[in-house]
């Protein structure tokens, strides 16, 4: 363990890991839910590791495949994360910004249809206010950068430099609420290219740009089967 | 196993059109794109294009006009077809399956463009 | 479209010596992947998203950059490693492959 910085050692040796690139490193290769300590050593927060796609270490924010979670929650929840790690969940947007306090994150976006076609994005940087102060007061800005196409087509570089936005705390640039026009909560801008915390709906859709969308793939009238969100350092 | 083939015609005229087929198996072409990569003798790698999961497809702008791809997913199969060919089209042509990158290529046909 | 210029073209070394292969991008890109291939022999994928080993690929190689600067390493050369070295990027279509390095052992 030579070389590694003193946090770092710290987390090592106490076995208190800060995502699942350091799961990985205690040598727990497989998909499933495991501890992190991203604000220190008291406070557990169970995460979905996906240690298997494209060489794994992925720590997963947000996951949703069958609409058994309501998605369509307050800044509250959002802020500090609600559902359960093995099945759909928001792993909590102050939970988001320790992360990438610390470490520098790439992000991965994997998507499916109702017709079992899966896609994804990438993007090389991804951080959550990673200059402010307060990160509640600046919003939890987004940060992505570095796209690179797996299918999906880029939906998220439209919302970079937003504030997030729930029905309760309305942030967008939009003269009405993006998050309860759209039912869902987002980075919104006015209003989006992706409401991955969208409605359920379940394939193709009538009412326009409410559902899991990601315009760039599957436009504003269809709503995906599965969506992860997740980070790794890079 | 992922594996990918490639089958062509090997011997086009100038002017022809090719065509080949990619038949894949040990992974489902609803969960991997496939990408094309062509290779001139005693040259450098050049990207054709690649079909996505859903059909969606991209090209090289540089031989968009004259290349086509698609595929049959029931069948596992990929199709690259190009008109017009030239002798510079003369070349081992690969299809490579996506994530991460291009993790598996074929073994690639070779296709030479003479009269 | 994003041009990738490798240097060098051709590098002959001795095996344990240290080897970097440079790909320079006429703009910025997201990451780069390396491919190793041997005459007569696919492509095979080295290194993604710049700095992941593919699988089966010795820790003696690793990759590194950004921006419009990336490179490939091995810090021990090893006879098995003599082939030609291609980057590649995929931030913008159409996908662009460098020009190759080739490496020969002496």
């Known amino acids: 363990v030579s070389g590694i910085r003193g946090d770092a050692l710290e987390r090592f040796c106490l076995q208190q890991p800060l995502d699942c690139d350091d799961i990985y490193a205690q040598g727990y290769q497989s998909d499933g839910v495991y501890l992190i300590y991203p604000s220190g050593p008291s406070v557990p927060v169970p995460v979905f590791c996906d240690m298997t796609t494209e060489g794994g270490k992925w720590t997963v924010f947000q996951k949703r495949f069958n609409g058994s979670v309501s998605f369509f929650r307050g800044w509250n929840d959002y802020k500090l994360g609600f559902g359960r790690a093995d099945g759909e969940y928001w792993l909590g947007l102050q939970n988001m910004h320790l992360l990438t306090l610390k470490q520098k994150y790439e992000l991965r976006v994997d998507l499916e249809d109702f017709e079992n076609n899966t896609a994804y994005a990438k993007y090389a940087d991804f951080s959550i206010s990673p200059n402010a102060v307060s990160a509640e007061e600046d919003g939890y800005t987004l940060f992505v950068a570095g796209f690179e196409d797996g299918g999906a087509g880029d939906s998220l570089s439209y919302h970079s430099g937003q504030k997030f936005s729930t029905f309760d705390r309305d942030q967008d640039l939009f003269v009405q609420n993006c998050a309860a026009l759209s039912s869902g909560a987002f980075w919104f801008r006015s209003c989006h290219f992706a409401n991955l915390n969208g409605f359920y709906l379940g394939g193709s859709h009538l009412s326009y740009a409410n559902g899991i969308n990601w315009a760039q793939w599957k436009g504003f009238y269809y709503s995906l089967k599965r969506t992860e969100m997740k980070i790794r350092r890079a | 196993e992922v594996q990918l083939e490639e089958s062509g015609p090997g011997l086009v005229a100038p002017s022809q059109s090719l065509s080949i087929t990619c038949t894949v198996s040990g992974f489902s072409l609803t969960r991997y794109g496939v990408h094309w990569v062509r290779q001139p003798p005693g040259k450098g790698l050049e990207w054709l294009g690649v079909?996505?999961?859903?059909?969606?497809?991209n090209y090289n702008s540089a031989l968009m006009s004259r290349l086509s791809i698609s595929k049959d997913n029931s069948k596992t199969q990929v199709f690259l077809k190009m008109n017009s060919l030239q002798t510079d089209d003369t070349a081992m042509y690969y299809c490579?399956?996506?994530?991460?990158?291009?993790?598996?290529w074929g073994q690639g046909t070779s296709v030479t463009v003479s009269s | 479209d994003i041009v990738l210029t490798q240097t060098p073209a051709i590098m002959s070394v001795s095996p344990g010596e240290k080897v970097t292969i440079t790909c320079s991008a006429s703009s910025s890109v997201s990451y780069m992947h390396w491919f190793q291939q041997k005459p007569g022999t696919s492509p095979k994928l080295w290194i993604y998203s710049t700095s992941n080993l593919a699988s089966g690929v010795p820790a003696r190689f690793s990759g590194s950059g950004s921006g419009t600067s990336y490179s490939l390493t091995i810090s021990r050369t090893e006879a098995e490693d003599a082939a030609t070295y291609y980057c590649q990027q995929r931030s913008s279509y159409p996908y662009t492959f460098g020009g190759g390095t080739k490496l020969e052992i002496k």
């Open positions: 079909i996505w999961t859903a059909g969606n497809t």
């Open positions: 490579a399956r996506d994530d991460p990158s291009m993790a598996y």
